[in-house]
């Protein structure tokens, strides 16, 4: 009679974490009499996974009725697979005796475990940056297996190329992590922009995971200022407006100075939003020119999002017919309020 062979038909089996793995094993003969044992690994450090004869193996069930006398199928199912279960499993026939002796081993089945990556988390810089500056975004995803993974960066649907990616650890592990850093150049139009990190892995079946960051949390668009003198509203009254345009975020404080003295301070409230997500705001002063003997230098000083103040000035000619002029000046800080000046914003 032909000698017993132990057949493990599957060279490899791949299972998703949490699922059950079926490991097939059949023998070609009922002789010699003796139990089957399953091991992870071979050699002196092999681990017993299942013993047909004795023992308690709560995660292992037999696929067929292995207790039947004529049974030759010794396939097993291992439940709730984790990445730590990866390895080569051997079905081993023993010859009955005292003790039982190893008779023949199958060729082994390599079990690999697939584990999904966690949702990518994208984080940007701690401090805001202005247009034309380059900022870094990081993307992290964890817990996946096998190690092979693809990560891409996008800005508003356009793929980015300036990034560096590492998968850790470099050696073998039950699961892996990916970390990527992308560099993004900000533009004034980026308030509504998004940076997207996309992770593709064999476990995701072609449906990649995405993590996003809104550039609105990263960008600061400084305002442009324009101070203009409006036509005379009434006798001896001049309306001066300060147009604060294209700024983001909304946090802004405006101070009017008359000849360097603080006249009024207000906080931007009823702003208008532009299509690109930036804001506009206007503040005005009603100046009673009859109260002044000399020309008046009016300065609109804006502190945006905690940054150093920027200002724009306008010279109001008291002696002659008012004419419009504008010049940038450094912020002035003298502190008296001037009467006969009225203001508002819109």
């Amino acid at each position: 009679e032909e000698e017993l062979q132990v057949i493990q038909p599957d060279k490899s089996v791949s299972v998703a974490a949490g699922e059950s793995a079926i490991l097939h094993c059949t023998v070609t003969s009922l002789i010699p009499v003796g139990p089957i044992q399953w091991f992870r690994g071979a050699g002196p450090a092999r681990e017993l996974i299942y013993n047909q004869k004795e023992g308690h193996f709560p995660r292992v069930t037999t696929v067929s009725e292995s207790t039947k006398r004529e049974n030759m199928d010794f396939s097993i199912s291992i439940s709730n697979i984790t990445p730590a279960d990866a390895g080569t499993y051997y079905c081993v026939k023993f010859r009955k005796g005292s003790p039982d002796t190893e008779f023949k081993s199958g060729a082994g089945t390599e079990l690999s475990v697939r584990a999904k990556p966690s949702a990518p988390v994208v984080s940007g810089p701690a401090a805001r940056a202005t247009p034309q500056h380059t900022v870094s975004f990081t993307c992290e995803s964890h817990g996946f297996s096998p190690r092979d993974i693809t990560l891409k960066w996008f800005k508003n649907g356009n793929e980015l190329s300036d990034f560096q990616t590492n998968v850790d650890p470099v050696g073998e592990s039950v699961s892996y992590s990916i970390h990527s850093t992308a560099k993004v150049v900000l533009t004034r139009e980026d308030v509504h922009s998004q940076v997207i990190c996309e992770v593709a892995h064999v476990t995701l079946q072609g449906d990649p995971l995405r993590g996003t960051a809104n550039l609105s949390e990263t960008i600061r668009v400084p305002p442009t200022l324009e101070v203009t003198q409006q036509p005379v509203r009434a006798e001896n009254q001049v309306n001066v407006t300060c147009q604060v345009r294209k700024f983001y975020p909304q946090r802004l404080q405006l101070t009017w100075l008359e000849n360097g003295n603080v006249s009024r301070t207000e906080t931007a409230s009823t702003v208008t939003e532009n299509k690109d997500g930036t804001y506009n705001w206007m503040s005005w002063l009603l100046v009673n020119v009859s109260a002044h003997r000399d020309d008046v230098k009016l300065t609109c000083q804006v502190e945006h999002d905690g940054q150093p103040a920027v200002s724009k000035s306008h010279d109001l000619k008291v002696s002659a017919h008012p004419k419009e002029q504008g010049s940038n000046t450094a912020a002035e800080n003298t502190g008296s309020n001037e009467r006969n000046i009225y203001g508002g914003s819109g």
Epitope: R40, G41, R95, K104, E172
Partner: antibody, heavy 122, light 112 residues
């Protein structure tokens, strides 16, 4: 192709601890035994011990009380530490890969490092 | 521990001629699964050992077919059918049945 590279100090003082690392490149650590073997000058080979991918270790009883082998799969490395060295521990130290797929025994030490010479001297 | 004894200690050879090395173990290396857990290694001068034969008679990858292993139980033999100059070095047998793994004392093969 799998390659092994030993690293560590070439000179160790008597009574101190010998520490060597073997870096595995070009292959998997899984399903193999990772062995340390030494060869004193002009003498034969002596098996010191090995570690399996599951962390189980086996040591030569003649050295057991002094030897520890550890495995860092994440770095693709395994290490040897031997305490209380004497001049008799002067040898070429090899790291090696041992195959296992035929039951209880082993199927050959098929990959060897180039060896590193360790001299124990004050 | 299993004691491995090799003979001869030294073996002068003539290129093109056959050569044979004996290895005896203090207990049987033939396991109940039918495998004889014995390896043969060659250590060329100044080099690391290399695996020639495993499980008593299986040639390792890349080993020329002039090398063959035989034997069972406690008596094993390595044969070189036609010695070549590159075959010089020290040959070791090693039992791989149980720990501690143990080597024979070595047989030095040199050209006459």
């Amino acid at each position: 192709q799998v390659q092994l590279q030993e690293s560590g100090p070439g000179l160790v003082r008597p009574s101190e601890t010998l520490s060597l690392t073997c870096t595995v490149s070009g292959g998997s650590i899984r399903n193999y035994y990772w062995s340390w073997i030494r060869q004193p000058p002009g003498k034969g080979l002596e098996w010191m011990g090995f570690i399996y991918d599951n962390g189980r270790t086996f040591y030569n009883p003649s050295l057991k009380s002094r030897v520890t082998i550890s495995l860092d799969m994440s770095m693709n490395q395994f290490s040897l530490k031997m305490t209380s060295v004497t001049a008799a521990d002067t040898a070429v130290y090899y790291c090696a890969r041992v195959r296992a797929y035929s039951g209880i025994g082993l199927d050959g030490t098929d990959v060897w490092g180039q060896g590193t010479t360790v001299t124990v001297s004050s | 521990d299993i004691v491995m004894t090799q003979s001869p200690l030294s073996l002068p050879v003539t290129p093109g001629e056959p050569a044979s090395i004996s290895c005896k173990s203090s207990q049987s290396l033939l396991y109940s699964n039918g495998y004889a857990y014995l390896d043969w290694y060659l250590q060329r001068p100044g080099q690391s050992p290399q695996l020639l034969i495993y499980l008593g008679s299986n040639r390792a990858s890349g080993v020329p077919d002039r090398f063959s292993g035989s034997g069972s139980g406690t008596d094993f033999t390595l044969k070189i059918s036609r010695v070549e100059a590159e075959d010089v070095g020290v040959y070791y047998c090693m039992q791989a049945l149980q720990t501690p793994l143990t080597f024979g004392g070595g047989t030095k093969v040199e050209i006459k």
